[in-house]
């Protein structure tokens, strides 16, 4: 006899990195018939939705109107139908930006390049942390650290066309805790021979729609989220 | 056009410091990495480190993190390079170059150590 | 630290001549490599950057290639001009380092 059912998938909308004092929705999506729902924050019971009619649900919400730094770190999600609870869904790193600073970023030798050159991204943040992390922006994004007293560098290698796209950093006060957004730095990988010397770093856009990037990177990958966040998540770790 | 413009020469005492600049035009000063590189007489190049002006990124060649600090000016688009506790050895030419690849040179500063 | 050996260090050759210098890495540095042309009062000017892209204005006798390890800079017909000193510089893996130079000689 099956003594507990499969575990939930467990994702943010619209992310995991949530700008501080910007709303959040935890979403957990277990079985129609499940009777509740808990959210466990760092550990403990944080939450509790109990869907009604639970036949017709199997997916609730926990909203975070405004996050904060407390509010950051790990979630988890379990579901119950009858007496029978759940297996613990995957962990989710909530992740609280824009505190403190902004860190700048550069690439080398320039954001304009030829496919075969070796570049390195460097990020510097003069404040108080000694780990970084660099973003591709994009369905595929992945997260690298680093680490350094005032910036890191994170080396590419031989590029190729793949890793044309938009990158930007944070410092990292501690797992869940990251700076603001750096200027987003768009890298351009060419195969041909023109001459890219002094061309000017050009940013898709400013800092400020960082927020509606996040709103909107997503759109149309719901049944991807929690694939998505898990994989970035476990750069993370 | 890109011009990196250096002093001819500088002429400094062992143990003192100089402080050698390199001031860009004809291109957006902000926006590139600068070189410094050292020549001694009849020698080869060495690569000292380079800054991004906008950034304030720095990267030194462990050979000389101890020796050399680099800053910038963007107000007057001008890259510095101070060199300290000078002896004999620092005697050289210093250039600076602009852009990630190196694509534009300066001239050069002569520096020489003497007493 | 990657080593760039240049080969030979020096060379007599003729006007009209073809001549390769060549640079072998220590490591990988993909197209990360420059040439350099040094005149004897000291002016330095990139003639060649990511292997095989000619800088503009440079003449096109000039041309840049790779084979493994191995890169070289090709001068297809020597002008009087060009009797200076040459350098490869990779700015792969730092610290960048260049090789020891070319002393390019009339015959």
């Known amino acids: 006899q099956q003594q507990t059912l499969p575990k939930p998938f467990i994702w943010a909308e619209p992310h995991f990195m949530v700008p501080k004092e910007k709303q959040v929705t935890i979403c957990c999506q277990g079985n129609y018939g499940a009777v509740e729902y808990q959210l466990h924050f760092e550990g403990s019971l944080f939450a509790v939705d109990r869907p009604k009619p639970p036949e017709r649900i199997n997916k609730v919400q926990f909203y975070i109107p405004d996050m904060n730094s407390r509010m950051a770190g790990q979630y988890s999600c379990i579901y119950r139908v009858g007496e029978l609870w759940s297996e613990p869904s995957n962990l989710l790193d909530l992740v609280v930006t824009e505190m403190y600073d902004t860190p700048t970023l550069s690439v080398h030798p320039g954001p304009e390049v030829i496919s075969g050159e070796k570049v390195t991204f460097y990020c510097r943040l003069d404040t108080a942390t000694s780990m970084f992390l660099l973003l591709k922006e994009g369905r595929s994004s992945h997260v690298q650290r680093g680490y350094g007293k005032v910036q890191a560098e994170f080396p590419l290698g031989p590029v190729t066309t793949a890793h044309r796209g938009t990158y930007r950093c944070f410092g990292s006060y501690n797992n869940h805790a990251w700076s603001f957004p750096s200027e987003p730095v768009k890298l351009l990988v060419t195969g041909d021979i023109e001459n890219t010397s002094l061309a000017p770093e050009d940013p898709t856009f400013p800092a400020d729609t960082w927020g509606t990037y996040l709103l909107t990177t997503e759109t149309g990958l719901q049944k991807d989220h929690a694939l998505w966040d898990h994989t970035a998540q476990n750069l993370l770790r | 056009q890109v011009q990196l413009q250096q002093p001819g020469a500088e002429l400094v005492k062992p143990g003192a410091s100089v402080k050698l600049s390199c001031k860009a035009s004809g291109y957006t000063f902000t926006s590139y990495w600068m070189h410094w590189v050292k020549q001694r007489p009849g020698q080869g190049l060495e690569w000292i480190g380079m800054i991004h002006p906008n950034s304030g990124v720095t990267k030194y060649n462990e050979k000389f993190k101890s020796k050399a600090t680099l800053t910038v000016d963007k107000s007057s688009s001008t890259a510095y390079m101070q060199l300290s506790s000078l002896t004999s050895e620092d005697s050289a030419v210093y250039f600076c170059?602009?852009?990630?690849?190196?694509?534009?040179w300066g001239q050069g500063t002569l520096v020489t150590v003497s007493a | 630290d990657i080593q760039m050996t240049q080969s030979p260090s020096s060379l007599s050759a003729s006007l009209g001549e073809r001549v390769s210098l060549t640079c072998r890495a220590s490591?990988?540095?993909?197209?990360?490599l420059n040439w350099l042309q040094q005149e004897p009062d000291g002016t330095i000017k990139r003639l060649i950057y990511a292997t095989s892209s000619l800088d503009s204005g440079v003449p096109k006798r000039f041309s840049g290639s790779r084979s493994g390890s191995d890169y070289s800079l090709t001068i297809s017909s020597l002008e009087s001009e060009d009797f200076v000193d040459y350098y490869c510089l990779q700015y792969a893996s730092s610290p960048w380092t260049f090789g020891g130079g070319t002393k390019l000689e009339i015959k």
């Open positions: 170059a602009g852009d990630g690849r190196f694509a534009y």
């Open positions: 490591q990988d540095i993909g197209s990360s």
